[in-house]
Amino acid sequence: ELNDLANHRMFSFHDGGVQISCNYPETVQQLKMQLFKDREVLCDLTKTKGSGNTVSIKNPMSCPYQLSNNSVSFFLDNADSSQGSYFLCSLSIFDPPPFQEKNLSGGYLLIYESQLCCQLKLWLP
Amino acid sequence: ELNDLANHRMFSFHDGGVQISCNYPETVQQLKMQLFKDREVLCDLTKTKGSGNTVSIKNPMSCPYQLSNNSVSFFLDNADSSQGSYFLCSLSIFDPPPFQEKNLSGGYLLIYESQLCCQLKLWLP
């Protein structure tokens, strides 16, 4: 099921910035999603549940995000993603077991100065 | 600002079910959003922050949801919203003060058996 997740639209424009969507299987209950920009961790979001099923969300890098039951979207200013960078979603699944780590969708993003053109130069599922 | 929130599309189709979107001001940091179906509380989502700014989300009625910085969307199966029901988003604002309770957008939803037609019979902002 994880292999199917690359077939979604990873980049879109959102309020003058870029939305980067990282999809994951709906069965995943607890996870860590990291967004890499080239080799640097740009965003790091962890969702866990306690024994009372309360959700705890850790966002140590304070990335603007949106979380649903099958995706994490990170919102970047254009400045964060200019000059052409390779973005990669990396997923760690804590629950359900077994523990898994997967590199999900990846893509090369180039934003022209016009801020109107978002070109995927390379698409690596 | 709260009065402007009714002017959004409350209902939309999503994966064969219905997405009900309850918008709130972006300034709100901690809140409870309840979705009423007629007079019954169908969904109840509370977002609070702890001392380390960690987000805690309580969803005691286990509704599928999506949370962003200005909206809570609940996802219902068509069965949940057939036969015509009035849906209402009710917001409690904990932070920033002062504490406020507001009924936001409300609408009457009827889904025909074809599951292709979503008709808003009544729209009460």
Partner: antibody, heavy 117, light 111 residues
């Protein structure tokens, strides 16, 4: 190997206070929610409360809410239970447990707290 | 709060017996495709140990004679071919919501 070692139990008078500790080793302490579970002599298990990975969320059983406080020190890899206004019904063995995402997968040996005048 | 009940409260068993312990919750523990129901074993003088999580998944190292089954509100722990080292108390536990609660326990004693 995961190890949890409780300490601080003993005899305490009704209305008194006691602080229990749980030293954790063998895993990345700051990655896990942690819980306290107690067991009165000859009785079953009862959940006391929990705390999330960085200590910003804590939840409590209705039986101890307002009297007990759970905290943690991720530098010292230690979990704490501060017990105030104790009652005779708080007499129990108190276990520290790691919430392994979907179950209590590791437990300490327990420390006995006796509330008596 | 969700109330967990177990039956029987105690059971006299012999080596080789097939043992069945029942657990019932006051509301469904099914969320999505998961039942938030766990089984623990506690031997005399020891801390509890995890046996089964998500109603039917055996924890690492747990012998395959232990089997969990059930869904919704009714669950069963089965020990196929009971061994004397299986003596002790068995507890079901839910983590569907707060507060998580345990069943009252089932004590297995030698016949």
């Amino acid at each position: 190997e995961v190890q949890l070692v409780e300490s601080g139990g003993g005899l305490v008078k009704p209305g008194g206070s006691l602080k229990l500790s749980c030293a954790a080793s063998g895993f990345t302490f700051s990655d896990y929610w942690m819980d306290w579970v107690r067991q009165a002599p000859g009785k079953g298990l009862e959940w006391v409360g929990n705390i999330d990975e960085d200590g910003s969320i804590a939840e409590y059983s209705p039986f101890v809410k307002g009297r007990f406080t759970i905290s943690r020190d991720n530098v010292k890899n230690t979990l704490y239970l501060q017990m105030n206004s104790v009652k005779s019904e708080d007499t129990a063995t108190y276990y520290c447990s790691r919430w392994g995402r979907f179950a209590f997968d590791s437990w300490g040996q327990g420390t006995l707290v006796t509330v008596s005048s | 709060d969700i109330v967990m009940t177990q039956s029987p409260s105690s059971l006299a068993v012999s080596a080789g017996d097939r043992v069945t312990i029942n657990c019932k919750s006051s509301q469904s523990l099914l969320s999505g495709s998961f039942n938030y129901l766990t089984w623990y074993q506690q031997k005399t003088g020891q801390a509890p140990k995890l046996l089964i999580f998500y109603a039917s998944t055996r924890h690492t190292g747990v012998p395959d004679r232990f089997m969990g089954s059930g869904s919704g509100t009714d669950f069963t722990l089965t020990i196929n071919s009971f061994q004397t080292e299986d003596l002790g108390d068995y507890y079901c536990h839910h983590h569907y919501n707060a507060p998580p609660t345990f069943g009252p326990g089932t004590k297995l004693e030698l016949r």
